[in-house]
Interface confidence: low
């Protein structure tokens, strides 16, 4: 983009400040609350917009089980630590000095402790399953449709390449959806299953972080498929470490 | 549809410059990469080089820096491809093509009809 | 720069064949190769993606295999209209390169 273009935005990403004060006048984004240049030609990493959000004003066809070291994001929001390439630093503290470890998404993966607390590397999720409940319709949907529009949106909105999408399993109303990528299956430029999940999320809920495109309007053969909940489980390449009183 | 249209035909002088367009619709132009390619005649496919839409940063192959410059203009959803100091030899059809960002997705889903450049004394 | 070899360079086959195309790169391309089809005076069109992904709309006697070095491009029956120039390329690494081009003719 260039100084005389009006139209500096992040399509990516609208939780950013956008000027053209880039190379030769370029126009270039700044996500809010760490003001860091982002590439709006891809999606933004979860922890910058994790960060944003907290700096903004508030207002075969059977399921998968979940393993047993399956995490699920039951902390919630937090204010975290990025590194200089957008990624969750591997250990996150809050204002009162406790600390845990987190995975490559940003979830919790140790119990809490001080200061004291050694994270020794960043651990990769490399495997998502987001289970989905669609509301009730007239039939079940047809698996194949829903498998094709589900890896289409995952490649067309998201930008994730197919090969990363690993199934999409059904059984009315349960849909759910594996990501799967190993660190070295990651190509540079690949979009990682953690942002695509994230931002797949925040759509289904209604609070797309895309720049002045409409909501997220799934449509199987023109059927609506409109969702009530959303669980998402994380699996990381090196199981988590609890304590037993967590798992009780 | 999805749709890339390039500006017509060019017979250019030895030394001149050209500049083809390459005007898309069917999609968010800064959501995808163009690239551009050539092909002599009865030749290969060679590629020159390609633009990060959303970022309007350039990348060129070696065998054409310094003589060619590849931009953008996202308000007419158009890029364009201007080669300089011609010579006989870049007699070639030019296309524009449609691809990702990423390593993973720089292959090309849709191209454009393509545009002969003659270069002739 | 990557190289790209394509084999054979030229081929006749009849309709209702099986035909394999073969590109091997110089280096190490993971599963980064695109397949296009060619016919004269025209643009060339994508056939498969990422070594085995059939683009929308390809026939599915278009097929592509392979990892690292070697690839294929395999039409298990060949119709009339299969009959052009078949181009590999690697989008692994910029430069991006092609294979020189293989003609598929008439028997």
């Known amino acids: 983009h260039t100084a005389a273009q009006d139209n500096c935005t992040c399509p990516t990403n609208k939780m950013t400040v956008c000027s053209p004060d880039g190379p030769g006048g370029r126009c270039q984004c700044r996500a809010l609350g760490s003001g860091m240049a982002v590439d709006c030609s891809t999606l933004t990493s979860k922890c910058l917009l994790l960060k944003a959000r907290m700096s903004a004003p508030k207002n075969a066809r059977t399921l998968v089980r979940p393993s047993e070291h399956a995490l699920v994001d039951n902390d919630g929001l937090y204010d975290p630590d990025c590194d200089p390439e957008g990624r969750f630093k591997a250990r996150q503290c809050n204002q009162t000095s406790v600390c845990w470890c987190v995975n490559s998404v940003g979830v919790r993966r140790t119990d809490k402790g001080d200061l004291s607390l050694r994270c020794d590397e960043l651990v990769r999720t490399h495997h998502i399953l987001i289970d989905l409940r669609h509301r009730p319709t007239a039939g079940a949907f047809n698996h194949s449709d829903l498998d094709a529009e589900l890896r289409r949106l995952f490649r067309e909105r998201y930008r994730l390449h197919p090969k990363f999408v690993a199934a999409v399993h059904y059984e009315q109303p349960t849909i759910q959806i594996e990501l799967r990528q190993n660190t070295s299956q990651k190509a540079a430029g690949d979009v990682d299953i953690g942002d695509a999940a994230y931002y797949f999320e925040r759509d289904i809920k209604g609070e797309s972080l895309f720049q002045g495109r409409g909501g997220l309007d799934l449509r199987v053969r023109g059927e609506p498929l409109q969702v009530e909940r959303t669980l998402i489980y994380y699996l990381d390449e090196i199981p988590p470490k609890f304590s037993m009183k967590r798992l009780t | 549809q999805v749709q890339l249209v390039q500006s017509g035909a060019e017979v250019k002088k030895p030394g001149a410059s050209v500049k083809v367009s390459c005007k898309a619709s069917g999609y968010t132009f800064t959501t995808a990469g163009m690239q551009w390619v050539r092909q002599a005649p009865g030749q290969g496919l060679e590629w020159m080089g390609w633009?990060?839409?959303?970022?309007?940063?350039?990348k060129y192959a070696e065998d054409f820096k310094g003589r060619v410059t590849i931009s953008a203009d996202t308000s007419t959803s158009t890029a364009y491809l201007q080669l300089s100091s011609l010579k006989s030899e870049d007699t070639a059809v030019y296309y524009c093509?449609?691809?990702?960002?990423?390593?993973?997705?720089?292959?090309?889903?849709?191209w454009g009809q393509g545009t002969l450049v003659t270069v002739s004394s | 720069d990557i190289q790209m070899t394509q084999s054979p360079s030229s081929l006749s086959a009849s309709v209702g064949d099986r035909v394999t195309i073969t590109c091997k790169a110089s280096q190490d391309v993971s599963t980064a190769v695109a397949w296009y089809q060619q016919k004269p005076g025209k643009a060339p069109k994508l056939l498969i993606y990422?070594?085995?992904y059939r683009y929308t709309g390809v026939p599915s006697r278009f097929s592509g295999s392979g990892s690292g070095t070697d690839f294929t491009l395999t039409i298990s029956s060949l119709q009339p209209e299969d009959f052009a120039v078949y181009y590999c390329q690697q989008h692994y690494i910029t430069p991006l390169t092609f294979g020189q081009g293989t003609k598929l003719e008439i028997k």
């Open positions: 093509a449609r691809s990702g960002f990423g390593s993973s997705y720089w292959y090309f889903d849709v």
């Open positions: 990422s070594a085995s």
């Open positions: 633009i990060n839409t959303a970022s309007g940063v350039p």
